[in-house]
């Protein structure tokens, strides 16, 4: 009874086609596989960034895999081939592991590379990305960021830099079709007389980083004796009703302050016929329905309302 | 397997010029990048420079002006060029192989004396 | 530049003994970029810690590192005969990069 063995899969390697992080991962079948012609191989791939605690894992009959990597550090993979226990008569059989590496050979001393970069999308329509010089870097140096979405043919790069001494430190995307909900790869590179310049990389999903106009329109209703009732419009933009979470803060007569975070473009709150001003603002933020994060919008107009019978509705700017 | 060996050192007189060379071999310069790091008898290290796999140089800028890296990726080499040599000078100097931003791998050394 | 400061320059110690080794740097340097090396006589230094708490290839786990900002410690949890050496810690976060100044640590 000869025991059943494998080979690894060839020609195992990471390639990188120029889309800043997005990487594939391919090979070939292993070697002598004639003997298990009736057989659908499969492969293990294991794969993740050097230094992350865990692998990924997928398990695959195709002789390639697409992901994104943070190209600031390595990634290292492996891979080996599987035979189905329909195939063997018995247990799965597993191969040895091929390996490979892939890192972007740096240039240029870490401190060299932007500081403090931050990219904001503006009511999930326009975004902005901005940045700081790398530490001791002369105003020689220019940095030039470089973009790339699935759906993009290659990378772009900036055409709308923000300038300061001469200096790009921000720029100013166009219109970005079909570009949320993936990852949205850039890299900031940079070029000195003076010395090499560090790259960096950032990965992120447009839609988490969406900062939306405040809300528009503060109004109150009184309900009742005891109620009133705040309502404001949904700022103008793409962005529907059913992403919305909102924040209020209500100021009663200078001193009581209310905050409140809520779902609606309303709330009831509670007064007392002693109550002589109310004040409130409103700012909103894309909620957890249609992203994982997101940044709040500035604070809205204030709205107060005030006079002895707060029932006259003496509605002040 | 990696190594990296140095040679080239030797007795030089003050003003002088010196080239150190730095065989690697297990890896490819156009893959990593090597810096030179020097030691003087008894003391600690001090970085002098590297020489970037894309072939651009960072230097320590109090050595910028008298000592110059270059390579040749065809003879998977590193060069260490030293002008206008003073006493302090005097050293063992090392080849080092960047990885990751950390010098994973050393050489042995060449021994470097400037003095009259 | 940034200044290293290692303390002390150097101890005695014996075999089974632990070893606690302390890095100054003048200015915040990341833990990415803070390595230690181990230098024994008339060898060529040898990376012993990468990123302030990661052994590199090859090294017995009673040697750790940790710290962060303008701190740092290489510690020998049960001192052996190999491990007489001088150590010395290294920023490569800012032009130029830096050593220690080295901790020879001696057999007691």
């Known amino acids: 009874d000869t025991e059943i063995k494998v080979n690894p899969p060839q020609d195992f390697e990471i390639v990188d086609p120029g889309y800043l992080g997005y990487l594939y991962l391919q090979w070939q079948p292993p070697l002598s596989l004639d003997h298990f012609k009736e057989c659908t191989v499969e492969y293990e791939l294991k794969y993740r960034n050097i230094g992350s605690e865990t692998w990924k894992t997928i398990i695959t009959k195709n002789l390639h895999y697409k992901d994104g990597f943070d190209l600031n550090k390595g990634i290292e993979a492996k891979i080996h081939t599987l035979l189905p226990w329909q195939c063997t008569n018995g247990s799965e059989v597993q191969s040895s592991w091929a390996e490979t590496t892939y890192w972007i050979s740096p240039q240029g001393i870490p401190e060299t590379k932007v500081q403090d970069m931050d990219c904001v999308y503006y009511n999930w329509q326009y975004l902005l990305c901005s940045w700081k010089p790398g530490i001791g870097v002369l105003l020689d140096t220019n940095y030039n960021l470089f973009y790339w979405y699935e759906g993009l043919d290659h990378a772009l790069q900036c055409v709308d830099y923000i300038k300061a001494d001469g200096q790009n430190i921000g720029c100013r995307f166009p219109y970005l079709e079909a570009s949320d909900y993936k990852d949205f790869y850039i890299c900031v590179n940079g070029s000195s007389e003076n010395k090499p310049i560090r790259s960096s990389y950032f990965t992120f999903q447009l839609q988490n980083i969406v900062k939306p106009l405040p809300p528009v329109y503060l109004t109150f209703t009184r309900e009742s004796s005891c109620e009133i009732k705040l309502k404001w419009s949904i700022p103008l933009g793409p962005i529907p009703a059913r992403c919305f979470d909102y924040e209020i803060e209500i100021r009663e007569d200078d001193t009581t302050l209310v905050t409140a975070t809520v779902e609606n473009e309303t709330y009831t709150l509670k007064t007392t016929n002693e109550t002589r001003q109310l004040c409130f603002v409103v700012r909103s933020k894309v909620n957890i329905y249609c992203s994982d994060d997101g940044i709040w919008s500035e604070w809205s107009d204030k709205q107060c309302w005030e006079g002895e019978d707060l029932s006259k509705k003496t509605l002040l700017r | 397997e990696v190594q990296l060996v140095e040679s080239g050192g030797g007795l030089v007189q003050p003003g002088g010029s010196l080239r150190l060379s730095c065989a690697a071999s297990?890896?490819?310069?156009?893959?990593?990048?090597v810096h030179w790091v020097r030691q003087a008898p008894g003391k600690g290290l001090e970085w002098v420079g590297v020489?970037?796999?894309?072939?651009?140089?960072d230097y320590n800028s109090a050595l910028m002006s008298r000592f110059t890296i270059s390579k040749d990726n065809a003879k998977n080499s590193l060069y260490l060029q030293m002008n206008s040599l003073r006493a302090e000078d005097t050293a063992v100097y090392y080849c080092?192989?960047?990885?990751?931003?950390?010098?994973?791998?050393w050489g042995q050394g060449t021994l470097v004396t400037v003095s009259s | 530049d940034i200044q290293m400061t290692q303390s002390p320059s150097s101890l005695s110690a014996s075999v089974g003994d632990r070893v606690t080794i302390t890095c100054t740097a003048s200015?915040?340097?990341?833990?990415?970029?803070l390595h230690w090396y181990q230098q024994k006589p008339g060898s060529s230094p040898k990376l012993l810690i990468y990123?302030?708490?990661n052994l590199a290839s090859g090294v017995p786990s009673r040697f750790s590192g940790s710290g962060s900002g303008t701190s740092f410690t290489l510690t020998i949890s049960s001192l052996q005969p190999e491990d007489f050496a001088t150590y010395y810690c290294?920023?490569?976060?800012?032009?130029?990069?830096?050593f220690g100044g080295g901790t020879k640590v001696e057999i007691k």
């Open positions: 200015l915040s340097v990341s833990s990415t970029y």
């Open positions: 020489k970037w796999a894309g072939g651009s140089t």
């Open positions: 990123s302030t708490s």
């Open positions: 297990g890896f490819s310069l156009t893959k990593y990048g």
């Open positions: 080092a192989r960047d990885h990751r931003d950390a010098m994973d791998y």
């Open positions: 290294h920023q490569y976060h800012r032009s130029p990069l830096t």
